[in-house]
């Protein structure tokens, strides 16, 4: 069987402060069963950026309709970007469990923030 792939096509994205950033992510299969989460940074200190099920992420919205059937596009849009948002963002697939188990991460997309043009 083909192994699940988590595809982040852009290695880097540059956005002007105050604009929105789109971070793209697709997966190659609906299975194994389990959620996708977005993080900034890697390792134990990484910051959770978006999880549709839990938490409150007012500046983050999924690009595709969250109610879309059999959706394999897990891209997100972050609004009102500030310099503090700079970093590398990872789209991560988890296997359903108690707790969920990290299965595979995308290669990451580095977000850089340009000064807002005057």
């Amino acid at each position: 069987e083909e192994e699940l792939q988590v595809i982040q096509p852009e290695k880097s994205v540059s956005v002007a402060a105050g604009d929105s950033a789109t971070l793209n992510c697709t997966v190659s299969s609906l299975i194994p069963v389990g959620p996708i989460q977005w993080f900034r940074g890697a390792g134990p200190g990484r910051e959770l950026i978006y999880n549709l099920k839990e938490g409150h992420f007012p500046r983050v919205t999924p690009v595709s309709d969250p109610t879309k059937r059999n959706n394999m596009d897990f891209s997100i849009r972050i609004s009102n970007i500030t310099p503090a948002d700079a970093g590398t963002y990872y789209c991560v697939k988890f296997r359903k469990g108690s707790p969920d188990v990290e299965l595979k991460s995308g290669a990451g997309t580095e977000l850089s923030v340009r000064a807002k043009p005057s």
């Epitope: 069987e1 699940l4 299969s29 609906l30 299975i31 194994p32 069963v33 389990g34 959620p35 996708i36 549709l52 099920k53 999924p62 969250p66 109610t67 879309k68 059937r69 059999n70 959706n71 897990f74 296997r95 359903k96």
Partner: antibody
């Protein structure tokens, strides 16, 4: 057209075993999680087990006794049922999972079911 | 485990009338709720998912509403083929997937 056809039901004594099969057609079987749901006579629906690719999930009532598996080359889902009890008597439905909200599953196609009767 | 409670257990309605019944979750399931119809001797059939989205081919007289812990399925102008048992199912937190106990819609 999606079709799911269960087979393998029958009458078995308590403590016995049965293997149910579900032949699937009309969709890309290997791309979807699959589920068994049962319905005791005159009762409601009870989730039994779900399989993704290598990942399997079971209701507490069947854990350790039932094993779900799939053969993607044959487009077939299986449920091996061991140590059967009277309370396992039910119609067993095979269902295709559909995913929404990034991680949740519901069941968009169902087979007609196969009856399992556990009785001495 | 999330418990789903459906009410009423039985609803007696005349053909052409409106039927409304509810599904209450023991904890927040957001919009992760589906509704199924089961006619006598048949397999369940998906009607609604994501609390309010009609499955392809389901007549417009079926509508779902609600979020969180309170959900409603409404059938406007009941047809003869609508007399059946209706189940809700949550998929927010699993395993286990859980179903409500069902509401039987019978002819008055």
């Amino acid at each position: 057209e999606v079709q799911l056809l269960e087979s393998g039901g029958g009458v078995v004594q308590p403590g016995g075993s049965l293997r149910l099969s579900c032949a699937a057609s009309g969709f890309s079987f290997s791309n979807f999680a699959m589920t068994w749901v049962r319905q005791a006579p005159g009762e409601g629906l009870e989730w039994v087990s779900t399989i993704g690719s290598g990942d399997t999930y079971y209701a507490d009532s069947v854990k350790g006794r039932f094993t779900i598996s799939r053969d993607n080359s044959k487009n077939t889902l299986y449920l091996q049922m061991n140590s059967l009890r009277a309370e396992d008597t039910a119609v067993y439905y095979c269902a295709k999972d559909s995913t929404v909200s990034w991680s949740g599953d519901f069941f968009d196609y169902w087979g007609l079911g196969t009856l399992v009767t556990v009785s001495s | 485990e999330i418990v789903l409670t459906q009410s009423p257990a039985t609803l007696s309605v005349s053909p052409g009338e409106r039927a409304t019944f509810s599904c209450r979750a023991s904890q927040n399931v957001k919009n992760d709720l589906a509704w199924y119809q089961q006619r006598p001797g048949q397999a369940p059939r998906l009607l609604i998912y994501a609390a309010r989205i009609r499955e392809t081919g389901i007549p417009e007289r079926f509508s779902g509403s609600g979020s969180g812990t309170e959900f409603t399925l409404t059938i406007t102008s009941l047809q003869s083929e609508d007399f059946a048992v209706y189940y809700c199912q949550q998929y927010y937190d699993w395993p286990p997937f859980t179903f409500g106990g069902g509401t039987k819609v019978e002819i008055k």
